[in-house]
Amino acid sequence: ARNGDHCPLGPGRCCRLHTVRASLEDLGWADWVLSPREVQVTMCIGACPSQFRAANMHAQIKTSLHRLKPDTVPAPCCVPASYNPMVLIQKTDTGVSLQTYDDLLAKDCHCI
Amino acid sequence: ARNGDHCPLGPGRCCRLHTVRASLEDLGWADWVLSPREVQVTMCIGACPSQFRAANMHAQIKTSLHRLKPDTVPAPCCVPASYNPMVLIQKTDTGVSLQTYDDLLAKDCHCI
């Protein structure tokens, strides 16, 4: 149940995909990844107001309980709904190889 | 890659399963759910310090970039890794039915 995509907080303030440029040094991968030296990391950032992109029933419950008990129950959180795969070129004991990752780059986002 | 389960912030402070008692009124379900009148909602609450229960490579990246750019990149968030199903007894147009929900109660938690 992917709920409303209208952000009541104003354009770009709610949960959505952002791109953050990161070097291998930033990621702590410099000693084992050869290429690329820079990754355009797509990640999910933004607020999750009531029913905005609610991933499922649990997210809807969380919204209701957060409204009632904000000190106990946190608001839903903006996280990846799916991922884009990526291939990195890595150093190995035997030389250089392609290493595939299915869960590295966010593809789209929801609130949960 | 499910990383360390030791919480550096002290017992019970990090991402874990909590149970929150909620009435149908709390959940906004009073007009369509007949039973149960009260739900023991299991949800994921707590901090996600560096590499604690990191769900995948994306969570590890997020930790690294949050450390570098805390104003831009949020810390990973404590969310369900899986769910327990639940059956509710509902009012329908034709009477009363059992309705199964697969995504209502968190079963275990991770950081993403």
Epitope: L34, S35, P36, R37, E38, Q40, N84, P85, M86, V87, L88, I89, K91, V96, S97, L98, T100, D102 | -
Partner: antibody, heavy 120, light 107 residues
């Protein structure tokens, strides 16, 4: 925008050596590796190898091992492919291609190609 | 090495037609397949990576699907500028290998 510009056509005799250049612009040269691919007249595409400008690490196709050398010059953002002991079946268009930003084993954008003709 | 087999080797079609090209890998490559378009005298152009992800700037009439060993490139409504040769390429392991190509010709 990202651009790869290759050196001009070459005619070589069997046994000679050719060195093709590929000048990159529009991005940080040592952030992405360069692949080399060739295409014989009327034929399909054949991957030759890969080099990362950052460290100089290379991977070569086994059939070319010992005859091919890939290098880079970071000061001029240029990649080079040298092929030795040329034979007539090395006649081909030689392409350089950058790793795609999304995944290192997809190729794009590409250079315009360099025709190398091996003939006695 | 992983062998890539493309079919058909050529296809005759008209503007507006739906065209499907298939590519089979000799062993499982998960989703690590790319598709390229090449016009005569020009360099190949990346259309699709990771089996189904459309490269930026590529028209949405191109789509890719498949995983494991069997993959498909579909052009939903062929345009005049789409007459070209199409290649698949596996990106799961070195050496990278290409299919033999499929020439899309005007009927």
């Amino acid at each position: 925008q990202v651009q790869l510009v290759q050196s001009g056509a070459e005619v070589k005799k069997p046994g000679a050596t050719v060195k093709v250049s590929c000048k990159a612009s529009g991005y940080t040269f040592d952030s992405y590796g360069i692949h080399w691919v060739r295409q014989a007249p009327g034929q399909g595409l054949e991957w030759m190898g890969w080099i990362t400008a950052y460290s100089g690490d290379t991977v070569y196709a086994q059939k070319l091992q010992g005859r091919v050398t890939m290098t880079t010059d970071t000061s001029t953002s240029t990649a080079y492919m040298e092929l030795r002991s040329l034979r007539s079946d090395d006649t081909a268009v030689y392409y350089c291609a950058r790793e795609s930003g999304q995944t290192s084993s997809a190729l794009g954008p590409w250079g315009q190609g360099t025709l190398v003709t091996v003939s006695s | 090495d992983i062998q890539m087999t493309q079919s058909p080797s050529s296809v005759s079609a008209s503007v507006g037609d739906r065209v499907t090209i298939t590519c089979r890998a000799s062993q499982g490559i998960s989703r690590w397949l790319a598709w390229y378009q090449q016009k005569p005298g020009k360099a190949p152009k990346l259309l699709i990576y990771a089996a189904s992800s459309l490269q930026s700037g590529v028209p949405s009439r191109f789509s890719g699907s498949g995983s494991g060993t069997d993959f498909t490139l579909t052009i939903s409504s062929l345009q005049p500028e789409d007459f070209a040769t199409y290649y698949c390429q596996q990106g799961a392991s070195f050496p990278l290998t290409f299919g033999g190509g499929t020439k899309v010709e005007i009927k």
